[in-house]
């Protein structure tokens, strides 16, 4: 049965040109971490193994940074990157847990942070 | 299996700088990060920053920007910390360590740096 | 910064017995929590990742628990071989801190 929670940063807005820290975490169970995805609709962002550390894909490498934590840095944002992103938590032995942000980059300065939200 | 093998003990002058290395083995290494670490006698243990060899990435803890400076050399899977304007202060074990959150961190033997006339 | 508060910075104890160490940080860190043996002149030595997961090759008797601010390590049976200083680390956000360490001692 799974019992863990993924909590995300929720609903996030960021200016065009900055950058922006997506954070989840995984509660609730004490399952074993093996890997995590980042994906932005149906593109991998990145990956951390437990094994074999971060892969950031090609087409990212130069404005995406591993971390903090298991959580990915989005740098020289464009509008373009307004979107969904998923956190995919592969743990053993509970299966796939996976969490929802969503970006909104901002041409004005009036980008604010919106609230937590948790994922059963 | 993954090793990080450390160079050897160095005494140095006040106010001259060091590079201590730290050769990675058993992994890729520009998959990870590397953090520095010093130990002092009575001080425990202090995070002086890290670097992302794979995009070469770093941070600092606040209180060592200026006194560390850390690179890496992909070609030879070799991270460095260079200590510059070196003091008393400066003597210390110095450690390299891998993580990655969901896996356990691996650590370096450790550098025994000591600063004197 | 976050503040990693550890407790007890000593401590004695029998072989044997249950022995818990506890790190307090000043503000929530989600898991992001290690905890470390280290031995007179020897590099640390990962017992516990991710607050509750053991590290390969790490005895069974050594457990971690905790979630939030609140984190801590267990032995469950004292050995001779437990003697060391145990060191918590959060690394969840940067600068990552430690805590000042607890030097366990067998009675």
């Known amino acids: 049965m799974m019992t863990g929670t993924i909590e995300t940063t929720g609903n996030i807005s960021a200016e065009k040109g900055g950058s922006i820290i997506l954070q989840c975490h995984l509660s609730s169970t004490t399952a074993q971490v093996t890997q995590v995805n980042w994906e932005q609709q149906d593109q991998l962002l990145a990956i951390c193994n437990a094994d074999l550390g971060w892969h950031i894909s090609p087409s990212f490498k130069d404005r995406v940074a591993p971390g903090p934590g298991l959580g990915l840095t989005l740098q020289s944002l464009t509008v373009n990157d307004t979107g969904e992103y998923f956190c995919i938590y592969h743990t053993y032995p509970d299966g796939t847990y996976t969490g929802r942000i969503f970006l909104e980059v901002l041409e004005s300065s009036v980008a604010e942070h919106g609230a937590r939200f948790q994922i059963p | 299996q993954v090793q990080l093998q450390q160079s050897g003990v160095e005494l140095v002058r006040p106010g001259t700088s060091v590079k201590i290395s730290c050769k990675a083995s058993?992994?890729?290494?520009?998959?990870?990060?590397l953090s520095w670490v010093k130990q002092r006698p009575g001080h425990g243990l202090e995070w002086i920053g890290d670097?992302?060899?794979?995009?070469?990435?770093?941070n600092y803890n606040e209180k060592f920007k200026g006194k560390a400076t850390l690179t890496a050399d992909t070609s030879s899977s070799t991270a460095y910390i260079q200590l510059s304007s070196l003091t008393s202060e400066d003597s210390a074990v110095y450690f390299c360590s891998r993580s990655t959150i969901i896996s356990g961190a691996y650590w370096g033997q450790g550098t025994l740096v000591t600063v004197s006339e | 910064d976050i503040k990693m508060t550890q407790s007890p910075s000593s401590t004695y104890a029998s072989l044997g017995e249950r022995v818990t160490i506890t790190c307090k940080a000043s503000q929530d860190i989600k898991s992001y929590l290690s905890w470390f043996q280290q031995k007179p002149w020897k590099s640390p030595k990962t017992l516990i990742y991710y607050a509750t997961r053991l590290a390969d090759g790490v005895p069974s008797r050594f457990s971690g628990s905790g979630s939030g601010q609140d984190y801590s390590l267990t032995i469950s049976s004292l050995e001779s071989d437990d003697t060391a200083t145990y060191y918590c680390l959060h690394h969840g956000e940067r600068p990552y801190t430690f805590g000042g360490g607890t030097k366990l001692e067998i009675k």
């Open positions: 058993g992994y890729t290494f520009t998959n990870f990060w």
């Open positions: 670097i992302f060899p794979g995009g070469d990435y770093t």
